[in-house]
Interface confidence: medium
């Protein structure tokens, strides 16, 4: 079979948005299925039509309805004779447009007075293609090739900047470019401390705007009163937005203020936030925990605990635990150092053990009290212990 | 003159095989693609696929991929749809078209019944 | 799956014109096809390659195509003319072929 791409030279130059229409001939056979290729993958296009003009020669149309970039290539017709392909020589489909960016210049922030660089590049065909530099509304420079670097030596408010490429097909122009002035960053807001201690303070906070320069660090400076001598300072890298501060005192007040900074320097401090720190929980236990029993049940008592230290605060109610054998158990808490017990199985062991607590929590508990079903009254000893 | 004369009319129980006809005639069968075109009752026209001129290719819509095979017999110039499982909601009119987007000549239609 | 998208139904006075849209995003690159067919007959081939007319096709029909949208326009449409609309185009790929959800045309 003869085959043959008809009224398209070895190459054909169209104009982005036209038609084209690829004519194959073929000939010395009667049914011939064409199929067409491009630049070796073929095309799975049903815009196709078969004209016979013969018995043994058909001519197959493959149509492009408006051609664009991607269409461009090498293009062939093939058919299937006798378990063999047989192929055309190849038509080179060239698609010309007004340029085509493949880098348009971009937006940045600089420091004020700062030296900059935009890119720009696009390409035809048609070649050669130009640029034209545009800052605002004035065009700056005469045309260049493309690729085009322009040179800025400094800006002193937000500006744009946009580039125009030419070819003989006509001109395009690029996205417009904004180049803004970097500051100082704002001040952070919505400091918060949570996770308090006796002795550490976790802070958060929400960065202000970064003056359109990436905020490097933060510094969280800690005093003992608003205006007081500095406690601490520590300067976090971020993100993230928190510090962890240790090594505070106990029961202490305290007030602490942040600021971030980028690389033109350090924002405001934000306002001064006060916090407190945790008291310690009771170091001691009570002593002495002995038992009575009465006629209405059995009455607990124990010594009182005096604070060991101030930072203990005052120190609050006791609070005492029991359980029985049969899996029975209760807590309760009073106020002064002795209890009525309720509830409980006089036939069975009775385990009592009592804390005294504070704002921060209960201190250790006592030596554990064993109330035996057998005892008229408990005394305090190890588990299991009997009194006779 | 270019006819496409069809199969009559069937009624088949979900789950049946079918095969429905197309025979060309007044054209050389080889000169034209043959496509297969659905019409559910009082809806709209869907492309079901076309077969080349020379019957080595088939082409198919999404929704019938795998689902119908269409096939001809040059010898004889008969198109062919088929199904190998029918569904009720295969139930519609079925046009054999010469051609694949120039749809000029269009046969009058086979209608398939598929009800338990 | 591609679609193209008609309008269900477009309602004029005799000798108005009928505009029916339809829209693909295949359309800028693919050919529309508009068929006709008139109730319990097969479908007629009215325009092809977006906007020539097939032979035997009265005058008053014609087609265009703009970016993603195909128009078939009825210039002083007739009692006749009332029937059923398919656009017919492939998908971007050109793999497969579709029709449009169809637009009755009234003609009161």
């Known amino acids: 079979a003869g085959l043959k791409l008809m009224g398209a030279p070895v190459k054909l130059t169209v104009s982005q948005g036209q038609p084209v229409k690829l004519n194959c001939s073929v000939e010395g056979m009667e049914e011939p299925d064409i199929q067409w290729v491009k630049d070796g993958a073929v095309v799975q296009n049903l815009d196709q039509l078969y004209i016979p003009v013969s018995e043994q020669h058909w001519i197959g149309f493959l149509s492009l309805k408006s051609v664009e970039r991607s269409d461009a290539g090498r293009y062939w017709c093939q058919v299937e004779d006798g378990g063999e392909t047989e192929i055309s020589q190849p038509v080179w489909l060239t698609v010309e447009g007004v340029p085509f960016f493949t880098v348009e210049p971009k937006d940045l922030a600089v420091p004020p007075n700062a030296p900059f660089q935009l890119s720009c590049e696009a390409v035809g065909p048609p070649e050669p293609v130009t640029i034209v530099w545009w800052r605002g509304t004035t065009k700056i420079g005469g045309p260049a090739p493309s690729p085009s670097v322009l040179n800025v030596t400094g800006v002193t408010q937000s500006t744009m900047f946009s580039c125009e490429a030419h070819n003989l097909k006509g001109l395009a122009s690029s996205r417009t470019a904004t180049v803004h002035l970097q500051a100082l960053p704002a001040a952070p807001f919505n400091i918060t401390v949570t996770k308090l201690s006796s002795s550490n303070a976790s802070v958060a906070w929400m960065p202000g705007a970064d003056g359109r320069a990436l905020l490097q660090s933060c510094t969280v400076q800690v005093t003992q009163a608003p205006g007081g001598w500095e406690v601490l300072a520590v300067v976090v890298p971020v993100p993230p937005f928190t510090c962890l501060l240790r090594d505070l005192v106990p029961a202490t007040n305290y007030s602490l203020r942040v600021r971030c900074a980028n690389a033109l320097g350090p924002s405001p401090y934000a306002d001064w936030v006060p916090f407190q720190t945790k008291g310690l929980a009771p170091a001691s236990a009570p002593q002495n925990l002995h038992a009575i029993r009465t006629d209405s049940g059995l009455i607990l008592e124990w010594e009182e605990v005096i604070p060991e230290a101030p930072l203990e605060g005052p120190l609050g109610p006791y609070k005492l635990s029991w359980v029985q054998d049969n899996g029975t158990q209760d807590e309760l808490t009073v106020e002064g150092t002795r209890a009525n017990l309720t509830g409980w199985d006089p036939q069975k062991d009775l385990i009592v053990r009592v804390c005294v607590s504070n704002a921060v929590g209960c201190g250790p508990w006592s030596q554990p009290l064993v109330v035996s079903s057998h005892d008229r009254a408990g005394q305090q000893g190890p588990p299991h212990s009997r009194t006779s | 003159e270019v006819q496409l004369v069809q199969s009559g009319a069937d009624v088949k129980k979900p789950g049946a095989s079918l095969t429905i006809s197309c025979q060309a005639s007044?054209?050389?069968?080889?000169?034209?693609?043959i496509s297969w075109v659905r019409q559910k009752p009082g809806k709209g026209l869907e492309w079901m696929g076309s077969?080349?001129?020379?019957?080595?290719?088939?082409h198919y819509g999404p929704s019938f991929q795998g689902h119908v095979t269409i096939s001809a017999d040059r010898s004889t110039a008969t198109a062919y749809l088929q199904w190998r499982s029918l569904e009720a909601s295969d139930t519609a009119m079925y046009y054999c078209?010469?051609?694949?987007?120039?749809?000029?000549?269009w046969g009058p239609g086979t209608l398939v019944t598929v009800s338990s | 799956s591609y679609e193209l998208t008609q309008p269900p139904s477009v309602s004029v006075s005799p000798g108005q014109t009928a505009r029916i849209t339809c829209s693909g995003d295949?359309?800028?690159?693919?050919?529309a096809y508009w068929y006709q067919q008139k109730s319990g007959q097969a479908p007629v081939l009215v325009i092809y390659?977006?906007?020539k007319r097939s032979s035997g096709i009265p005058e008053r029909f014609s087609g265009s195509s703009s970016g993603t949208m195909a128009t078939l326009t009825i210039s002083g449409a007739q009692v006749e003319d009332e029937a059923d609309y398919y656009c017919?185009?492939?998908?971007?790929?050109?793999?497969?072929?579709?029709f449009g959800g169809g637009t009755k045309l009234t003609v009161l």
């Open positions: 078209v010469r051609g694949y987007t120039h749809l000029r000549t």
């Open positions: 007044g054209y050389t069968f080889t000169d034209y693609w």
């Open positions: 077969i080349t001129r020379s019957s080595s290719r088939t």
């Open positions: 295949a359309l800028p690159k693919k050919y």
């Open positions: 390659e977006d906007s």
């Open positions: 017919y185009s492939a998908n971007q790929r050109g793999n497969y072929m579709v």
